[in-house]
């Protein structure tokens, strides 16, 4: 039988919210770093 994609892993379901928050936090930090870099330039 075909292996399920990662979205079917129970872990995906249980960690979806925290992983989404972590990703958003990462993106915010990246944007902040980019702004700082632009200021320096």
């Amino acid at each position: 039988s075909e292996e399920p994609p990662i979205s079917l892993d129970l872990t995906f379901h249980l960690l979806r919210e925290v992983l989404e928050m972590a990703r958003a936090e990462q993106l915010a930090q990246q944007a902040h770093s980019n702004r700082k870099l632009m200021e320096i330039i």
């Epitope: 292996e3 399920p4 994609p5 990662i6 079917l8 892993d9 129970l10 872990t11 995906f12 379901h13 249980l14 960690l15 925290v18 992983l19 972590a22 990703r23």
Partner: antibody, heavy 118, light 112 residues
């Protein structure tokens, strides 16, 4: 069949780092999260964190945040757990584990003993 | 963190007799999706843990039917209907409903 084969035992000095590997086979590596759990001698089990081998999303147990780094190499279906600034109470067997659509730790590696001693 | 408390710490058993292990969570471990992510693991001496039961009462593939799980809310039980020699070892309950995921302290099942 699903197999998780871990690297061999390590002896480290306090303050050093250790990197444990976990080679997966018998399934599509990117289809399942990889977790890490540790067990101090004669003690219980402690969940350390989880990594999504597909996208690289990582979530660490707050207790280990700042000291643990989990990575994967998709090309060789291998997960890694690096623990830095080792202390004597980090002496433990470190396990990698994979879940299913129904349970979180359905398959386990054989464990890697890390001994921290001066 | 959700504290998982197991009792007894040590359980002396007679082969062929039943055994029961209790696990209590410090708060309800019913997830927001209405499921209870309570699992039981067996660790034989010198071996890696092995999944026995998931979602309170479901046996994982290959697990003998002498193992059964029950409970709800904060009180859970693992029962072995007739203990066999291969059942000796340490049993851990685990909750995956709340972050961080946490294990109980373990119950050692040994020969009386």
């Amino acid at each position: 069949q699903v197999q998780l084969v871990q690297s061999g035992a390590e002896v480290k000095k306090p303050g050093a780092s250790v990197k444990v590997s976990c080679k997966a086979s018998g399934y599509t590596f990117t289809d399942y999260f990889m977790k890490w759990v540790r067990q101090a001698p004669g003690q219980g089990l402690e969940w350390m964190g989880v990594i999504n081998p597909n996208q690289g999303d990582i979530f660490y147990n707050q207790k280990f945040k700042g000291r643990v780094t989990m990575t994967v190499d998709k090309s060789i279906s291998t997960a890694y757990m690096e623990l830095s600034r080792l202390r004597s109470d980090d002496t433990a067997v470190y396990y990698c584990a994979r879940g299913t659509d129904r349970a979180l730790f359905a398959y386990w590696g054989q464990g890697t003993l890390v001994t921290v001693s001066s | 963190d959700v504290v998982m408390t197991q009792s007894p710490l040590s359980l002396p058993v007679t082969l062929g007799q039943p055994a029961s292990i209790s696990c209590r969570s410090g708060q309800s471990i019913v997830h927001s999706d209405a499921n209870t992510y309570l699992e039981w693991y067996q660790q034989r001496p010198g071996q890696s843990p092995r999944l026995l039961i998931y979602k309170v009462s479901n046996r994982f593939s290959g697990v003998p039917d002498r193992f059964s799980g029950s409970g709800s809310g904060t009180d859970f039980t693992l029962k072995i209907s007739r203990v066999e020699a291969e059942d000796l070892g340490v049993y851990y309950c685990f909750q995956g409903s709340h972050i961080p995921w946490t294990f109980g302290g373990g119950t050692k099942v040994e020969i009386k």
